[in-house]
Amino acid sequence: MSQDTEVDMKEVELNELEPEKQPMNAASGAAMSLAGAEKNGLVKIKVAEDEAEAAAAAKFTGLSKEELLKVAGSPGWVRTRWALLLLFWLGWLGMLAGAVVIIVRAPRCRELPAQKWWHTGALYRIGDLQAFQGHGAGNLAGLKGRLDYLSSLKVKGLVLGPIHKNQKDDVAQTDLLQIDPNFGSKEDFDSLLQSAKKKSIRVILDLTPNYRGENSWFSTQVDTVATKVKDALEFWLQAGVDGFQVRDIENLKDASSFLAEWQNITKGFSEDRLLIAGTNSSDLQQILSLLESNKDLLLTSSYLSDSGSTGEHTKSLVTQYLNATGNRWCSWSLSQARLLTSFLPAQLLRLYQLMLFTLPGTPVFSYGDEIGLDAAALPGQPMEAPVMLWDESSFPDIPGAVSANMTVKGQSEDPGSLLSLFRRLSDQRSKERSLLHGDFHAFSAGPGLFSYIRHWDQNERFLVVLNFGDVGLSAGLQASDLPASASLPAKADLLLSTQPGREEGSPLELERLKLEPHEGLLLRFPYAA
């Protein structure tokens, strides 16, 4: 391209400027003459002859068009423009290439696992409707009024009943298709299901046949009952339940084959339906044999109940269980039906709540676990199903036997209560990816302690340190036990402690971590590449 051509092009560009942006220079009327006829907004300036005007005109107001074109067309400026243009495009391409390299080299976001609803939070068992609702109540209609409370606990499912017709030890008077009239009608049940659905609470129905009798499956192996469970599954699935529980399956002959058959019916209806089996067994081999033939079965057992309340033993039980079950989804509880207080002293309740909510799997609680309900503290109450303490009037039998801090009402008003801790843990469990489906790594932290990390990809990570002992301990966190993907930082923020007195949100140095007796800490720290 010649210099002349370049100048011509510039001239055309300048000529096409909007009139109000054209140079106004007294020394030259060229701009106006080139612009053609007078246009709105332009003022023709008469060149003055007198000196004052000349002086004003002599005052510098920028280059004239001719001068500008002349300078712009000079080889230096042409080269500069080309260099800048080239630099711009090179820079642009460099940034593009950089972005591509970053995207290609950046670690892939880990694909989220398929999550069923029971993977997202805790299950809440109400085995005895009458005990749960208290004196003079105890039916399905009344339970509907307690759904807001269950919502406040952020539990994902309600394991209800059994509520079917059952006369103690009498097969002929056991009907898995009929609701015991003491609990209400089928219409009451349908209404409960609708209300629960609106509150995003799933309903799991316990179909343990002889729940009022000595043996849950009757004194001899009654095949007719097990056969009819199939029909009951179909009936209640059609009614809209989200799953089933059957307990004491160690008393059921050929339990594995029956469970497989029931699982097929449940999953055949929808993959979103759950089957929970309960056993009193705490033997890992027995538990594994039940799980072997039944994928997706949630099994509650007494496995953790013999943890002996020591950190090392609990760590050993948990890691053995997780190693043995592989990538199978687990559930965590201390038994298939009983309260935590049946197994634990009061000072360990908070610790176990923290553990159950942060282990990989579904935590399963019984009504009252959230407030530390203890049958032993309520004279005359059955161990399996003591009356739920909603407020101080819930147990009128012995005046003064119940204090405010034992009740739902009292604990709801106390941010340091067991109930408040339960709510906070339940909330964290249902929203943090690392707790929802994160990897689990247990590691050494010293005698008496059980500690582990939960982490998922580049999400916030959680460190749990539990002191089962009744003396204060210093945690020597052995990060060498951990894989590179789960390394420990120097400091982590305290999310919560099971004991009062610690400042939440404060960073704690992990090398100098000291735990109070029976204290559990939940700490969080960010992912570091």
Partner: antibody, heavy 115, light 107 residues
């Protein structure tokens, strides 16, 4: 009070299919088990099978290959079909409600298999 | 299949007597046994379930007993209307099975 009434042909030719219907009145056919039982002349009672309102069935293995029990909840009826009949299928056929044992029975209908 | 054996095909008794009809299961059926009364031209009528529980409306002269494999239906103070055939039935396992029946005759 639940009442049951069997209906169907009293005579069926060998190799054909025996069809009977039981109408339930005084109660809903839903949420219960409904069975067919037969008694050949001079012999004991034999359970044929049951149906439950979802359509789930359970048959006596000795007859399973030939039996179909179905339900029509809209009509409050359930039916029995027994294929490839022989003279040995001649019996009084009863429909009954099963609660493990049988608490309500129909009057029974005699079906003779003969050419 | 569980076989229910009623060894006595016929039993003879007099009005006002006490009579016991027996039934033996080929394997343990717990208490999952029912007894029926059947009169000619009529359907069977439930008398006893769960080995010992009287069905509603059944006179208290009918009593059931036994568990495991041996079961007994006892009619005390036999009445003329008790002339009928009596069947036992197990409901411990499918297929449900009946005894062959015991006919009660009045002397």
């Amino acid at each position: 009070q639940v009442q049951l009434q069997e209906s169907g042909p009293g005579l069926v030719k060998p190799s054909e299919t025996l069809s009977l219907t039981c109408t339930v009145s005084g109660g809903s056919i839903s949420s219960s088990y409904w069975s067919w039982i037969r008694q050949p002349p001079g012999k004991g009672l034999e359970w044929i099978g049951y149906i439950y309102n979802s359509g789930s069935t359970n048959y006596n293995p000795s007859l399973k290959s030939r039996v179909t029990i179905s339900v029509d909840t809209s009509k409050n009826q359930f039916s029995l079909k027994l294929s490839s009949v022989t003279a040995a299928d001649t019996a009084v056929y009863y429909c009954a409600r099963e609660t493990y044992y049988f608490d309500y029975w129909g009057q029974g209908t005699l079906v003779t298999v003969s050419s | 299949d569980i076989v229910m054996t009623q060894s006595q095909k016929f039993m003879s008794t007099s009005v006002g007597d006490r009579v016991s009809v027996t039934c033996k299961a080929s394997q343990n059926v717990g208490i999952n046994v029912a007894w029926y009364q059947k009169k000619p031209g009529q359907p069977p009528k439930a008398l006893i379930y769960s080995a010992a529980y009287r069905y509603s409306g059944v006179p208290d002269r009918f009593t059931g007993s036994g568990s495991g494999t041996d079961f007994t239906l006892t009619i005390s103070n036999v009445q003329s209307e008790d002339l009928a055939e009596y069947f036992c039935q197990q409901y411990n396992s499918y297929p449900l099975t009946f005894g062959s029946g015991t006919k009660l005759e009045i002397k």
